[in-house]
């Protein structure tokens, strides 16, 4: 049985997938920051899990997924203070009791060293310094992705 | 409604201890940051300490580092403050007050719990 | 740190006196300023949060705004439970910092 958060997490992806595909992101739009191939959005207001996935999701964007360490620090050095905190893409799944994020897969272990309680309704936050278990009802900041679409040259078929 | 009470505070000698606790009631305790905020006699406010949710995160003044501890036992829905190696400039009133993360205000205070140190 | 500067320090006025304080800020704070209200032997009150949101339950006399480093708390019409001392706080970064405090007296 899925939590109302597993639910709306789903939920999201799947109309996510449903849309027509949209022209590839050459450029992050106006306030948007390009990490690498990606273009983050650090909220300035204050949700809870749930609600930053939703904003996300109109943004046409999702909640941060970090691939790996590496990702983790270089998106760190853009907090400017210890005492922010921001929710990523990661919520616990009551049903596979695994950390998972929202685009399905599971947290490899060696991924994030996470601070505090894997259990129904803990959902991931990132700092300056850590990554840390919150109850997903509580209402921080929130950072979203855009992935950049890397630019090819075009190959034309002979007319 | 919302409360938080504050107790533990008295009379200690520079140098001494003393813990204080904050019992909160009227909301989902291990859903807020929370943070202890103090005021001199007859002075202003001053940040002391701050917690996250879920305890995993602290923060401190500088005036503080070291000789204070913040936590928090959401099984009691209580935030402590321990404070040891007290100086004379630690007398205030301490509150307790919801809040925390940045950008937080402190929404809601107790009623605050007077330490005073002096030999 | 971040440094936060009220004036004046003490001010006197009269019931329905309209009464303005103001906070200044170190460097760019943002909209990120808190007014509090205290009196004397309580606890303090939030009354603006954000610079410029009335907090729930508080007189829609109080009004906040500014953004960057200068900020204003005005009451609009002053009542006789409004004396008291008033405070600004930033939440930008940490330490968290307060005003040194505004005393509204009986004129």
């Known amino acids: 049985q899925k939590s109302s958060i597993e639910k709306c997490s789903v939920d999201i992806q799947q109309s996510r997938n449903k849309t027509t595909e949209r022209p590839g992101l050459l450029n992050c739009p106006i306030y948007w920051q390009q990490l690498r191939e990606k273009c983050l959005l650090f909220s300035h207001t204050v949700n809870p899990w749930n609600n930053s996935l939703a904003d996300c999701s109109t943004k046409e964007s999702s909640l941060l997924l970090i691939r790996d360490k590496d990702e983790l620090i270089h998106t760190q050095n853009l907090i400017r203070d210890k005492a922010i905190l921001f929710w990523i893409g990661l919520n616990f799944s009551l049903s596979e009791k695994n950390w998972k994020w929202i685009n399905g897969s599971f947290l490899n272990s060696n991924d994030l060293e996470i601070r505090g309680d894997a259990k129904e309704n803990s959902c991931i936050s990132i700092s300056q310094t850590s990554v840390y278990s919150e109850y997903c009802s509580t209402e921080i900041r929130w950072i979203c992705q855009k992935e950049l679409t890397p630019v090819r040259n075009k190959v034309y078929p002979d007319s | 409604e919302v409360q938080l009470v504050e107790s533990g505070g008295g009379l200690v000698q520079p140098g001494g201890s003393l813990r204080l606790s904050c019992a909160a009631s009227?909301?989902?305790?291990?859903?807020?940051?929370m943070s202890w905020v103090r005021q001199a006699p007859g002075k202003g406010l001053e940040w002391v300490s701050a917690?996250?949710?879920?305890?995993?995160?602290?923060y401190y003044a500088d005036s503080v580092k070291g000789r204070f501890t913040i936590s928090r036992d959401s099984s009691k829905n209580t935030l402590y403050l321990q404070m040891n190696s007290l100086r004379a400039e630690d007398t205030a009133v301490y509150y307790c007050?919801?809040?925390?993360?940045?950008?937080?205000?402190?929404?809601?205070w107790g009623q605050g719990t007077l330490v005073t140190v002096s030999s | 740190d971040i440094q936060m500067t009220q004036s004046p320090s003490s001010l006197s006025a009269s019931v329905g006196d309209r009464v303005t304080i103001t906070c200044r800020a170190s460097?760019?704070?943002?909209?990120?300023l808190n007014w509090y209200q205290q009196k004397p032997g309580k606890a303090p009150k939030l009354l603006i949060y954000?610079?410029?949101s009335l907090q729930s339950g508080v007189p829609s006399r109080f009004s906040g705004s500014g953004s960057g480093t200068d900020f204003t708390l005005t009451i609009s019409s002053l009542q006789p439970e409004d004396f008291a001392t008033y405070y600004c706080?930033?939440?930008?970064?940490?330490?968290?910092?307060f005003g040194q405090g505004t005393k509204v007296e009986i004129k």
């Open positions: 007050a919801r809040g925390g993360y940045l950008p937080d205000a402190f929404d809601y």
């Open positions: 009227g909301f989902t305790f291990s859903s807020y940051a």
């Open positions: 917690i996250s949710g879920s305890g995993g995160s602290t």
């Open positions: 460097q760019s704070i943002s909209s990120y």
């Open positions: 954000a610079a410029s």
């Open positions: 706080q930033q939440t930008y970064s940490t330490p968290l910092t």
